[in-house]
């Protein structure tokens, strides 16, 4: 006895496609075993018609393909466009076609639906609209107009020109008498029922000499597309509903148990608590079509999803929908990276974030999750030198360490950075991934001056306090700007004096600005790294002044408590372009980044003279890219 | 909810035939798939056959015990599952339950069918 199984019997009609499962242990061996799909000949071989080795026969080319998922234990054969010369025995199994390890399957594809008796077939997605045209002739023009619908041997009236529906159809259906010219009343029935489905009776007149027509309308079930996602990576159902119910609340919801189909997100406002911080409901077009994004994949999220459109935005008897089964495998090309980084208030984070390593060349964005309405990404930094205004002189995006991974290095935290942040590229639109900042109690470990002023033409010494847990780490003084941060010369002086408890192993590093200029001003960090992991920072702000008095400055902690300087912004001061990922499309078709301009940004993108706690030191008080 | 009603159960002698009808009724369209599963005396209650559908194609599922014996087919209009058992034996006779599924990744196991009917009795003497 085999240990494969399958479905013993396939019925279908022309032009339809099939989706068939097979089952099969899920051994080592057999996970990785070859898969085939084969049809068995009247002298008893089995001829392959694909594999998971890619072959594919030049029958099937262009419309099958076979899918493996071997978490499941399963693998699926899909074919499309199915015509009556499909029709026959079949074998699905593993490894070699003669060796036994199969099941028989028997594939029946009849006629199409067509014009049988004078019954015209109507076939309609649930949920959609139907139109019923009825023709008469002129003797019967001012008579009564009806359609019945077959329940058994009877006929039973389901609505007429006189006024009657039946309260099935109640608030869906209407029936609409064409123009003098046209001898044709037509019954539209909206918001298609699976139990709709049936023969119908339409007629002219209620006597010997009434016209009459048969219309067989059949009700489809969406097929569910099967989706094979990576964990930890992304997916997005694209849901395309018609034009018909534009206006209409559209949902994503995951089937679980019973009949019940819980909203994931829906444009009324509702979001599933599993799903915060890492989906994205992309606004709708002018048809009615919208798409769902949804990050950092997990092991549960699998599963039948459904999108739909109804009023109370949730899945209703007569919502036109979409059906997907989500498959989510968990032997990923996405590497494991946390999915929670925990920072100090004051102090930074170094988050890595995965891209596909075979697109080394596109462009990195980082974005921070917004929660309101549907959800959107709006971009803080990328790889090409934009950073949005806000973060100037604490964000950096580094291409470093390379091969498949970024780092954003966030600093000056304060409790408003706590959130979700989205990694992401211009390429592969599966590997957006989601990491959560949460903003702990505790001291910066690095200790700086909170504010420095040099003067022009004199030195400035600013020191760096490292406690000696970062004895085997590399230190280093960079100067941001916004393609990164430049390394800059910086001297060891020793153990430093600033931490209780702390040995020889501390350390105290300087950088020093000989003769200082205009273009030295601007923020400095200094920090940790080992090799390419970076590891804490900490910023200063350096202004520059004119000469007040000769000799040089050797800034020091004493000062790390002053106030941050106050000043406001001058009037020219550049807006720069917000940059937000609302449509998950322009990471896929169009790689392009959309500009909106800065205007209504929320609180992040106001421009205001407000304390440090607000938003971290005194970043926003000094523009120097005029 | 989803109601299920099975008949058709009976008593019957080895080797002739019998029909189960069950008829669903509520919230049908959110369902994929509905089977026939048997609980024979002192015995755990075990597969036998599954219908599953998209549009107007079926997939049929059978127990190696019954194939050729059974078969399984719908009613859509009526929301009525049929499992038609010819060449009856001794060894069929079992509770037969009816069940159904809005989500089915392997139609063998019963924890992916969410909703049952009562059960209709099938005695098959020698």
């Known amino acids: 006895k085999s240990p494969i199984f399958g479905p013993e019997e396939v019925n279908s009609v022309e032009g339809n496609s099939v989706s068939i499962t097979c089952y099969y242990p899920p051994t080592s061996v057999n996970r990785h075993t070859r898969k085939y799909w084969c049809r068995q000949g009247a002298r008893g071989g089995c001829i392959t018609l694909i594999s998971s080795e890619g072959y594919v026969s030049s029958k099937y080319a262009g419309r099958a393909n076979l899918t493996n998922f071997p978490e499941n234990g399963t693998f699926v054969v899909n074919i499309a466009q199915l015509s009556q010369d499909d029709s026959g025995r079949y074998k699905c199994g593993l490894g070699i076609n003669s060796r036994g390890l199969s099941f028989d399957v028997s594939l029946e594809v009849s006629q199409g639906p067509g014009l049988l008796n004078d019954t015209k077939v109507y076939t309609v997605d649930l949920g959609r609209t139907v139109t019923i045209n009825c023709p008469f002739k002129t003797e019967n023009a001012q008579k009564r107009k009806s359609l019945y619908k077959q329940i058994g041997l009877y006929p039973v009236l389901v609505i007429d020109s006189s006024g009657y529906v039946n309260p099935n159809y109640t608030g869906r259906i209407r029936l609409d008498i064409q123009g003098t010219g046209q001898l044709l009343f037509s019954v539209v029935i909206n918001q298609l029922r699976l139990s709709d489905a049936g023969q119908y009776l339409c007629q002219a007149g209620d006597d010997s000499n009434s016209n009459k027509k048969n219309a067989d309308l059949q009700v489809l079930k969406p097929e569910p597309e099967l989706v094979y996602e990576d964990l930890r990576g992304s997916v997005t159902f694209h849901c395309a509903l018609g034009p018909e119910v534009a206006n209409v609340a559209k949902f994503l919801c995951r089937q679980s148990s019973g009949e019940n189909c819980d909203v994931v997100v829906n444009t009324l406002g509702k979001r599933a608590p599993a799903f915060e911080g890492r989906i994205l409901l992309n606004p709708q077009d002018k048809d009615g079509s919208f798409s769902v994004v949804i990050t950092g994949l997990r092991k549960e999220d699998a599963g039948r999803y459904l999108c739909g459109a109804h009023s109370d935005g949730q899945l209703q008897e007569g919502s036109p929908i979409q059906a997907w089964q989500l498959f989510v495998n968990e032997e990923s090309t996405i590497p494991r990276s946390p999915t929670v980084v925990k920072g100090v208030a004051g102090s930074s984070v170094a988050v890595l974030c995965p891209y596909n390593r075979k697109e080394s060349k596109s462009i990195k964005y980082w974005c921070l999750w917004e929660g309101a309405q549907n959800g959107r990404c709006p971009l803080l930094v990328d790889s090409e030198g934009w950073v949005k205004a806000q973060y100037e002189g604490r964000l950096s995006l580094l291409e470093e360490p390379g091969n498949g991974t970024f780092t954003v290095i966030l600093n000056q935290l304060t409790s408003r950075d706590a959130g979700f942040y989205w990694c992401l590229t211009n390429g592969d639109t599966l590997w957006r991934t989601t990491v959560e900042i949460k903003i702990i109690e505790g001291e910066p470990n690095l200790k700086v001056p909170g504010n420095v002023t040099a003067v022009l033409g004199e030195t400035l010494k600013v020191p760096c306090h490292f406690p000696c847990k970062f004895s085997s780490y590399e230190k280093y003084w960079c100067k941001w700007n916004n393609t990164g941060c430049q390394a800059l010369p910086s001297q060891d002086e020793g153990p430093s004096k600033a931490f209780v408890n702390c040995d020889e192993n501390s350390r105290l590093v300087s950088l020093t600005l000989n003769l200082v200029t205009r273009a030295d001003e601007g923020w400095y960090w200094c920090g940790v790294k080992q090799g390419h992991f970076y590891g804490e920072t900490a910023a200063v702000y350096v202004a520059v002044e004119e000469r007040k008095a000769a000799g040089s400055r050797d800034v020091s902690l004493a000062k790390a408590d002053a106030a941050p300087d106050e000043k406001v912004l001058d009037s020219g001061f550049r807006e720069i372009e917000n940059k937000a990922i609302q449509d998950p499309r322009l990471f896929a078709e169009e790689k392009a980044v959309a500009d909106t301009r800065d205007q209504a940004d929320g609180s992040r993108a106001s421009v205001d003279s407000g304390s440090s706690e607000e938003q971290g030191g005194s970043s926003r008080h000094h523009h120097h890219h005029h | 909810q989803v109601q299920l009603v099975e008949s058709g159960g009976g008593l019957v002698q080895a080797g002739d035939s019998l029909r189960l009808s069950c008829a669903a009724s509520?919230?049908?369209?959110?369902?994929?798939?509905m089977g026939w599963f048997r609980q024979g005396p002192g015995k755990e209650r075990e597969f036998v056959a599954t219908?599953?559908?998209?549009?107007?194609?079926?997939?049929?599922y059978y127990t190696d015990s019954v194939k050729g014996r059974f078969t399984i087919s719908r009613d859509n209009a009526k929301n009525t599952v049929y499992l038609q058992m010819n060449s009856l034996k001794p060894e069929d006779t079992a509770v037969y339950y009816c069940?159904?599924?809005?989500?089915?990744?392997?139609?063998?196991?019963?924890?992916?069918?969410?909703?049952w009917g009562q059960g209709t009795q099938v005695t098959v003497s020698s």
């Open positions: 219908i599953t559908w998209s549009g107007s194609t079926n997939y049929k």
């Open positions: 069940a159904a599924s809005t989500v089915l990744t392997d139609p063998r196991r019963l924890n992916e069918y969410d909703y």
């Open positions: 509520g919230r049908t369209f959110t369902t994929y798939g």
